[in-house]
């Protein structure tokens, strides 16, 4: 599998992974004990036909062209978890692996 | 996990799974021996903020609001394989499980 990586200086218009640091402190999310910030990344860009299509299904839907199908969009195709320490609703401290918090790759689906 | 199911008579504007039968014969894709057609489904509809968001990451990116982030789009969040019989490039008949051919659920990511 393959995905493009870009940064804020890139001129790439196609679907690409961009760096993004999420800052829980800046959001005022005080129930998150740690990390206070982490590298989350995000996906942005255009999905020309066939470019970075994750699934054969995407191509088949384009071919069948049903009513209301908007064409593929740039979205995470591989994600990974991070470990977090946080308060749950009962004010207990929880340490756990939270899935799908980091975008590792972007593609068109 | 939860996703909406719609059909061609639905008035739902939000992200939804719609039925779609892919017909390889109609495409002229005769290198696919079987199946000749299968129920693939597809995703279509609007992604209002927080509706059917698959990942906490989606919410975080919205919150951080980086340059060029287009907001979530309606995309497959659960897919399943089908068994296929087909000719490869060397004209050998291959029988195999092809991943991500059927959309089981749609969501916003």
């Amino acid at each position: 599998d393959f995905g493009l990586d870009c940064d804020e200086h890139s001129t790439e218009s196609r679907c690409c992974r961009y760096p993004l640091t999420v800052d829980f402190e800046a959001f005022g999310w005080d129930w998150i004990i740690a990390p206070k910030r982490y590298k989350a990344n995000y996906c942005s860009g255009e999905c020309e036909f066939v470019f970075l299509q994750k699934y054969p299904h995407t191509h088949l839907v384009h071919q069948a062209n049903p009513r209301g199908s908007a064409g593929p969009c740039c979205t995470p195709t591989k994600m990974s978890p991070i470990n977090m320490l946080y308060f749950n609703g009962k004010e207990q401290i929880i340490y756990g692996k939270i899935p799908a918090m980091v975008v590792d790759r972007c593609g068109c689906s | 996990d939860f996703g909406l199911d719609c059909d061609e008579h639905s008035t739902e504007s939000r992200c939804c799974r719609y039925p779609l039968t892919v017909d390889f014969e109609a495409f002229g894709w005769d290198w696919i021996i079987a199946p000749k057609r299968y129920k693939a489904n597809y995703c279509s509809g609007e992604c209002e903020f927080v509706f059917l968001q698959k990942y906490p990451h989606t919410h975080l990116v919205h919150q951080a609001n980086p340059r060029g982030s287009a907001g979530p789009c309606c995309t497959p969040t659960k897919m399943s394989p089908i068994n296929m019989l087909y000719f490869n490039g060397k004209e050998q008949i291959i029988y195999g499980k092809i991943p991500a051919m059927v959309v089981d659920r749609c969501g916003c990511s």
Epitope: - | D30, W31, I33, N83, F87, E91, I93, Y95
Partner: antibody
């Protein structure tokens, strides 16, 4: 509806060749295997081979391999079976049959449509 | 090649009878067995595939069973139109091979 129409009866001399045709209609000809089966008078059925019209990939019974050629003409949706160096024991009715895939496994097939058969008589 | 031995080679029965035809393969054929009916001067007609599945449009009086090397075709209540020759076919391996046939005659 799906139909296979075969060419008419032939009388051939030993050592000659015969080419039997099978014209398909009512379906996408290129996407289904065509098989050839023969039956000598008063005898059982014998599988000769198959061909996939899309790419002409074929598979022959070793018993006939040196003498048989299966071909297709996609423009007319017609399959052909040529048998060379005919002998008297090649006298038989030759059938074409479409092989239909019904299942989920690599050998999930059955014959759903047959041609009417072509009698080939080999006699000096 | 896989040998298919069909028995009996001929069988006399009366209308209303229940009859069974067997087919034995020279090795395990993984239930890739079909049954055909053939009437004089006609092409064979598929009845059963994958050992026990009925082809669309075939009456339920026909049934198939078996696994491994041994398979049977049963006709539950014979009607005049059922008197014909029946063949089995293995499709587990190339070349496909047929049984020698069972001729079902009116007693």
């Amino acid at each position: 509806q799906v139909q296979l129409v075969q060419s008419g009866a032939e009388v051939k001399k030993p050592g000659a060749s015969v080419k039997v045709s099978c014209k398909a209609s009512g379906y996408s000809f290129t996407g289904y295997f065509m098989h050839w089966v023969r039956q000598a008078p008063g005898q059982g059925l014998e599988w000769m081979g198959n061909i996939y019209p899309y790419n002409s990939v074929s598979n022959y019974n070793q018993r006939f391999k040196a003498r048989v050629t299966m071909t297709v003409d996609k423009s007319t949706s017609t399959a052909y079976m040529e048998l060379r160096s005919l002998r008297s024991d090649d006298t038989a009715v030759y059938y074409c049959a479409r092989r239909y895939y019904y299942g989920t496994g690599p050998a999930d097939w059955y014959y759903d449509v047959w041609g009417q058969g072509t009698l080939v008589t080999v006699s000096s | 090649d896989i040998q298919m031995t069909q028995s009996p080679s001929s069988l006399s029965a009366s209308v209303g009878d229940r009859v069974t035809i067997t087919c034995k393969a020279s090795q395990d054929i993984n239930s890739y067995l079909s049954w055909f009916q053939q009437k004089p001067g006609k092409a064979p007609k598929s009845l059963i595939y994958r050992a026990n599945r009925l082809v669309d449009g075939v009456p339920s009086k026909f049934s198939g069973s078996g696994s491994g090397q041994d398979y049977t075709l049963t006709i539950s209540s014979l009607q005049p139109e059922d008197f014909a020759t029946y063949y089995c076919l293995q499709s587990d391996e190339f070349p496909l091979t047929f049984g020698q046939g069972t001729k079902l005659e009116i007693k």
